[in-house]
Amino acid sequence: MKVLQEPTCVSDYMSISTCEWKMNGPTNCSTELRLLYQLVFLLSEAHTCIPENNGGAGCVCHLLMDDVVSADNYTLDLWAGQQLLWKGSFKPSEHVKPRAPGNLTVHTNVSDTLLLTWSNPYPPDNYLYNHLTYAVNIWSENDPADFRIYNVTYLEPSLRIAASTLKSGISYRARVRAWAQCYNTTWSEWSPSTKWHNSYREPFEQ
């Protein structure tokens, strides 16, 4: 049994880091493998992650971490029984993938303005709370070409757009994702999408 693709990990910079790797053949990850991880810190204790299958030869492990900060560095040991298959390290702050925003809502009752709001996925005491920027994706269910991205570079988790910038009388969907420049993160996953029917009064033409 050998590791074909070494583990690569990303952290949500809050409580979970996710590591993925590939073995050289079909593997029952949860019964055959264990990923041990330990913070390089005084008094830290070793923890064991039981991986799950992610495709035939792929494995994924969700590492639980408390109080993640920039100084943290973890040692990783991948074991198959008594055999050490791979040894490495992981610094969560250098591989951050933010959590996806939640509770995306479209408010259509503001005079010909669409107000989209969502929730910041981090608590106020997490460093990323005040450092997320967002991308909002809006698209038409009827017209695949009607697809647009709005970059929200301010901190408030909301976006206002004129309803008239979208076509009237048809259904749209929206979703939002986040990233943080301070840690040069990757983009988060998209939030679940929300749907609304866009309708507004056309200006009266003589």
Epitope: F41, L43, E45, V69
Partner: antibody, heavy 116, light 111 residues
Amino acid sequence: QVQLVQSGAEVKKPGASVKVSCKASGYAFTSYYMHWARQAPGQGLEWMGIINPSGGSTSYAQKFQGRVTMTRDTSTSTVYMELSSLRSEDTAVYYCARGKWWLYDWGKGTLVTVSS
Amino acid sequence: QSVLTQPPSVSAAPGQKVTISCSGGSSNIGNSYVSWYQQLPGTAPKLLIYDNNKRPSGIPDRFSGSKSGTSATLAITGLQTGDEADYYCGTWDTSSPPQPIFGTGTKLTVL
């Protein structure tokens, strides 16, 4: 919100021991290390040691080895710091502080006076 | 126990900028992260800066930290009378056994 409530002031004679408590609330007690530091009157901060409330393991500053004992009670989310063989130079305010690489939250401090 | 060196005192008028230095060595600041603590008279220390330059929520952006080599600096702009306090830098000494160490402390007077 996070609160670290320390026990009240103590007056001790040289050679005696003192046990200071620090009751934590507002967070997952076993998820954060607890440090102890002290500050003599008009002096700076001095680190004494650290305890991992999860397993109870400890590490002490060399200066206090053999004289200090840190323990915890997970049922009450309380950590304790006991200092023995007290001398006059141990007169100080003793602080518990939650954190790992840095100390996020501090107790208000417990004044321990050592005097004959 | 090694100590980080800070100036005993600094002073400036309200509205001005002041900086407080913290000098260490390769076994501490040079190889670790720096934090800063504010201690108002008669109170416990409070975390002001961590991770060299990050502010906990609730700390105004008048306070900033930086690190270069084996020294670190705390800068306070738009000084207010309420900033009058003792300031301590902190880091980890990575010699064996590793342990946190604090600076000697700086008394800030707002004139």
